[in-house]
């Protein structure tokens, strides 16, 4: 008789999840000499241990502590790029501007990027059928708790000038309910962070508005200022050209406006 399985509203664990995590770990530690000491089998065991046999709506940050310990990594604290609702451009940027880092440029962020996972209470099975949706089911699910944990730690590590890329095409350029708005903003350390600099990425080709005057940006400025951190805001009017010119400043198209 097939065992009854909880049906969640979200997609199930990513196909070949264990193999993917292990392969990503091996690849990352090969590319990053400072992480060569990491034992990827232990990393996978710690990752698995955080959610296997546990109710997928009852995961805590504590569950991920063994993984956090194994994935401890030092990135230059003054070279951190946060992002909200504009992941692809942020990643393209750090691929070019190699001395800046998003969370997904760290081992733990790299391992989990774009993956979904969950287990089942009291069985060692991974649930490939469905996993809890943050809104429809529960917020304390394995994926959400993981990102909340690593995002908090990443923000806590930041110092000096912290940059954040925001999507100027969205109705809420700054969204208090995003991971950036609900976790990272509140975990920047005022004694270490001097300035948060927002880069608002424009979507429209002819959009010359100063989106730094947007009410949600003013809200972000207010939150940040109350935390005794200075705030600065920049418009990136032509993101495609911006990336191209960061990559190759001598390019003839970069001698005109971007």
């Amino acid at each position: 008789v097939p065992r009854w399985r909880q049906q969640w509203s979200g997609p199930g664990t990513t196909k070949r999840f264990p193999e993917t995590v292990l392969a990503r770990c091996v690849k990352y530690t090969e590319i990053h000499p400072e992480m060569r000491h990491v034992d990827c089998q232990s990393v996978w065991d710690a990752f698995k241990g955080a959610f296997i046999s546990k109710h997928p709506c009852n995961i805590t940050e504590e569950d991920y502590q063994p993984l956090m310990k194994l994935g401890t990594q030092t990135v230059p604290c003054n070279k951190i790029l946060l992002w909200s609702r504009i992941k692809d451009l942020a990643h393209q940027f750090t691929q070019v501007q190699r001395d800046m880092f998003t969370l997904e440029d760290t081992l733990l962020g790299y391992l989990a990027d774009d993956l979904t996972w969950c287990g089942e209470f009291n069985t060692s099975k991974i649930n490939y059928q469905s996993c809890p949706d943050w809104r429809k089911d529960c917020s304390n699910n394995p994926v959400s708790v993981f990102w909340k944990t690593v995002s908090r730690r990443f923000a806590e590590a930041a110092c000096d000038v912290v940059h954040v890329m925001l999507n100027g095409s969205r109705s809420k350029i700054f969204d208090k309910n995003s991971t950036f708005g609900s976790v990272e903003v509140h975990n920047l350390q005022p004694e270490k962070v001097q300035t948060l600099e927002a880069w608002v990425i424009h979507g429209g080709r002819e959009d010359s508005r100063d989106l730094c005057q947007d009410p949600t940006i003013k809200e972000l400025e207010s939150i940040i200022s109350k935390r005794n951190i200075q705030f600065s805001c920049k418009n990136i009017y032509r993101p495609d050209k911006f990336l191209q010119c960061v990559k190759n400043p001598e390019d003839s198209s970069c001698t005109s406006e971007i």
């Epitope: 600065s232 805001c233 418009n235 911006f242 406006e257 971007i258």
Partner: nanobody, 126 residues
Framework: DVQLQASGGGLVQAGGSLRLSCEFS????????MGWFRQFPGKEREFVAA????????DYSDSVKGRFTISRDNVKSTMYLVMNSLKPEDTAVYYC???????????????????WGRGTRVTVSS
């Protein structure tokens, strides 16, 4: 820390030259336009010159065009203003600033800038 520090001001005779420097230290990424403004006693700051992020595009106020030259060295994190053929009416406090964008779209407006350095005084005697 992000700091814009203007230096190079001083006392010079009319017809003489000065080179102002603005160091934009504490920056990981220097991909934004920058500008020079000046302020006469009791007046608003006024636009002098601006340069885009790569140094390939510049803009000058009519009053300094042909006499002043703006440039930047992103490796040294420094912007310059070479001031030739100085006149007594150039006497002012000069400020450097970083713009809100990479290009020069709103570079003549004070609101187009969000980081300001401390000023350096230029006095031109007749």
């Amino acid at each position: 820390d992000v700091q814009l520090q203007a230096s190079g001001g001083g006392l010079v005779q009319a017809g003489g030259s000065l080179r102002l420097s603005c160091e934009f230290s504490g920056r990981t990424f220097s991909g934004f336009a920058m500008g020079w403004f000046r302020q006469f006693p009791g007046k608003e700051r006024e636009f002098v010159a601006a340069i885009n992020w790569s140094g390939s595009s510049v803009d000058y106020s009519d009053s300094v065009k042909g006499r002043f030259t703006i440039s930047r060295d992103n490796v040294k994190s420094t912007m310059y203003l070479v001031m030739n053929s100085l006149k007594p009416e150039d006497t002012a406090v000069y400020y450097c600033a970083e713009a809100r964008s990479a290009e020069l779209g709103s570079s003549r407006k004070i609101q187009g800038y969000d980081q300001w350095g401390r000023g350096t005084r230029v006095t031109v005697s007749s």
